[in-house]
Interface confidence: medium
C-alpha cells in the first residue's frame, strides 16, 4: 500500500507515534516519506547482506528476521515480511522499540539527512487529525 501523506499521519497518530519519545508526528511522516516514499512494501538491500523492510525501512540485521541475514538479532521478534503489511501496526511497534534504543530517530539515516532540523510540521499541515 502507498499511503497518502495525511492518511499516514492519521494512522501513525492512531498508533501512538505523535510525540513518542519526544518526536512529533511530523518527524515520523517525514521519515516515512524519505525512507520508503510512503510505500509499505518497500524493500532495499544493504551492502552488509541485510535488507530494509517497510514504510520505515526497518533493518533485518537488528530488528526483524528474514531468514537470511547472517547474525540477525531480531530484536523486535517479528518476521520482516510483517513489516510489509498494509497494516502498519508491526512497523510502528518495532519503530517504538528502535527509537527507544538510545539513538532516538538518528537510527533512520533518511530522517537524519532529510528531516532533522527542518520544519517537519509541514508534513502534517492541512491534515485533519
Amino acid at each position: 500500500k502507498v499511503f497518502g501523506r495525511c492518511e499516514l499521519a492519521a494512522a501513525m497518530k492512531r498508533h501512538g507515534l505523535d510525540n513518542y519519545r519526544g518526536y512529533s508526528l511530523g518527524n515520523w511522516v517525514c521519515a516515512a516519506k524519505f525512507e520508503s516514499n510512503f510505500n509499505t512494501q518497500a524493500t532495499n538491500r544493504n551492502t552488509d547482506g541485510s535488507t530494509d523492510y517497510g514504510i520505515l525501512q526497518i533493518n533485518s540485521r537488528w530488528w526483524c528476521n528474514d531468514g537470511r541475514t547472517p547474525g540477525s538479532r531480531n530484536l523486535c521478534n517479528i518476521p520482516c515480511s510483517a513489516l510489509l503489511s498494509s497494516d502498519i501496526t508491526a512497523s510502528v511497534n518495532c519503530a517504538k522499540k528502535i527509537v527507544s534504543d538510545g539513538n532516538g530517530m538518528n537510527a533512520w539515516v533518511a530522517w537524519r539527512n532529510r528531516c532533522k532540523g527542518t520544519d517537519v510540521q509541514a508534513w502534517i499541515r492541512g491534515c485533519r487529525l
Epitope: A42, T47, G49, D66, G67, P70, P79, L84
Partner: antibody, heavy 116, light 107 residues
Framework: QVQLQESGAEVMKPGASVKISCKAT????????IEWVKQRPGHGLEWIGE????????YYNEKFKGKATFTADTSSNTAYMQLSSLTSEDSAVYYC?????????WGQGTTLTVSS | DIELTQSPATLSVTPGDSVSLSCRAS??????LHWYQQKSHESPRLLIK???QSSSGIPSRFSGSGSGTDFTLSINSVETEDFGMYFC?????????FGGGTKLEIK
Amino acid sequence: QVQLQESGAEVMKPGASVKISCKATGYTFSTYWIEWVKQRPGHGLEWIGEILPGSGSTYYNEKFKGKATFTADTSSNTAYMQLSSLTSEDSAVYYCARGDGWYGYWGQGTTLTVSS
Amino acid sequence: DIELTQSPATLSVTPGDSVSLSCRASQSISNNLHWYQQKSHESPRLLIKYASQSSSGIPSRFSGSGSGTDFTLSINSVETEDFGMYFCQQSNSWPRTFGGGTKLEIK
C-alpha cells in the same frame, strides 16, 4: 515438511517466452524469498534473482534483467519465472530454492530446451 | 561481483580416502559461505552453511572450515555415495554467486 515442486520440462522455439512455476508447501510462503538459479553444463550454477512473495519485491542479477520476470501468487503458494525472447543460450535446468541466505530447499528443476 | 574459485576442478579418490576441497573468494565474505553436493540429474543438496555449520541430516564425515577468503570442505573417509559435484556459494552480497564446482570421482 518444506517442499518446492516445479513445473515440467519445456521445449520452446527461439524468440518465444516460457513461464516456469514453483509451488511451495510446508512453510509460510509469503515470508521467505524465493530464489531462481540457472544451471547449464559447463557453466555451473548462476543466480538469476529473487522474489518476496508477500510483497512482490524483486531483485534481479544484472545479467538477467530483461530476460527473466518473477511473479508470485500467495493464494496458491506458487512463484513463477517468465523467460522471454528465448535463444539457445537459455537452454538449461532452472531451479527455484527457498532463500535463507543458504539454499536448504530446492525444487527438482525444470529443463528448458530451446530449439528450432 | 564476488568470484568464487574452487580447486581442484576434479579430484580422483578411492573410497576410504579423506579429502579436502577448496573454495577461494575474490574478497572477504566473513563466514557467509555454503557448500552443496550435487549428483547427476539431481538438485543440489545443502551440506554446510555459514562455513562450518552442518545441515540437518548430513553425515558427520562432512565438515567445513574457513573465514574471510579461504574455505575448505573436508570429507573424512569418502564413501561411494559421496561421488559427484561439489559447489560453494556466497551470501555475503548480491548477486549471489557460486563456485565453478569440484568433481569428486572414483579413482
